[in-house]
Amino acid sequence: VLEVYYTSLRCRCVQESSVFIPRRFIDRIQILPRGNGCPRKEIIVWKKNKSIVCVDPQAEWIQRMMEVLRKRSSSTLPVPVFKRKIP
């Protein structure tokens, strides 16, 4: 399910990781497009062990995963994707 996510006008990620995380260990993914006070796109991953990580948007695995999720967005997703709306 795609939902709108509002956030404050600043970057959320201090550090980014490109290390692969299997989808079964991911609770949800938040995509923050650049703009709204942050000059870069950010991807925040909530994991099933309750930890949170910022993922490098250029990491191949997250790009593949996002593409799969986009293709499946017409049905119920196991990994909800949250997007920030830019006013």
Partner: antibody, heavy 121, light 106 residues
């Protein structure tokens, strides 16, 4: 040849502790997520825990959270499962197995031969 | 948690038969399903992953299909070495195994 060899199983009293080890060879251990899976005649196969490449990320089934700890030593190509506060329902054969590699590929699926854990007074 | 319902629990068949084993998930698992074969006293052996990808070295008489919540393993022509227990595994959210299907010689 890919090999995973478990050790450390045995008989332990309820409330006791046991540490399982899994030594691997034939592939680059640090490239793979690893997991522990257990099996009983009554409950069948159950995932127990998983760990990422460097050991910084761990995941557990609810019934073992706070009692079991999965860890790894990449220099020694070894995976561990520390089991504390053991219960009779933890009695099972415990297998270590490979998961995805660093690129997300799941081409390899290798299992150990299993280690028997019996929790009984 | 995702539950996996596997059927049948027991299956009697003869060499040369075509057999199918089913797994039904409690929610959409997006084809993230694996099939294993296990023989007595041995570790499980992966046959198929991602619903229909045949593991290297597994004979082509094994095939998998399905989508959403319903998945099937088919053995097109049973061989003597195929009599074993078969398990499904969902890997969409953590892990859940099916209870198993014991395939016996009729």
């Amino acid at each position: 040849e890919v090999q995973l060899v478990e050790s450390g199983g045995g008989l332990v009293q309820p409330g006791g502790s046991l540490k399982l080890s899994c030594v691997v060879s034939g592939f680059t251990f640090s490239d793979y997520y690893m997991a522990w899976v257990r099996q009983t005649p009554t409950k069948g196969l159950e995932w127990v825990a998983s760990i990422n490449y460097d050991g910084g990320d761990t995941y557990y089934r609810d019934s073992v959270k706070g009692r079991f700890t999965v860890s790894r030593n990449n220099a020694k190509s070894s995976l561990f499962l520390q089991m504390d506060s053991l219960r009779s329902e933890d009695t099972a054969t415990y297998y270590c197995k490979t998961e995805e590699d660093y690129d997300g590929s799941y081409v390899m699926d290798a299992w150990g031969q299993g280690a028997s854990v019996i929790v009984s007074s | 948690d995702i539950q996996m319902t596997q059927s049948p629990s027991f299956l009697s068949a003869s060499v040369g038969d075509r057999v199918t084993i089913s797994c039904k998930a409690s929610q959409n698992i997006n084809k993230e399903l694996t099939w294993y074969q296990q023989k007595l006293g041995k570790a499980p052996k992966r046959l198929i992953y991602n619903t229909n990808i045949l593991q290297t070295g597994i004979p082509s008489r094994f095939s998998g299909s399905g989508s959403n919540t319903d998945y099937t393993l088919t053995i097109s022509s049973l061989q003597p070495e195929d009599f074993a227990t078969y398990f499904c595994l969902q890997q969409s959210s953590l892990y859940t195994f099916g209870a198993g299907t014991k395939l016996e010689l009729k």
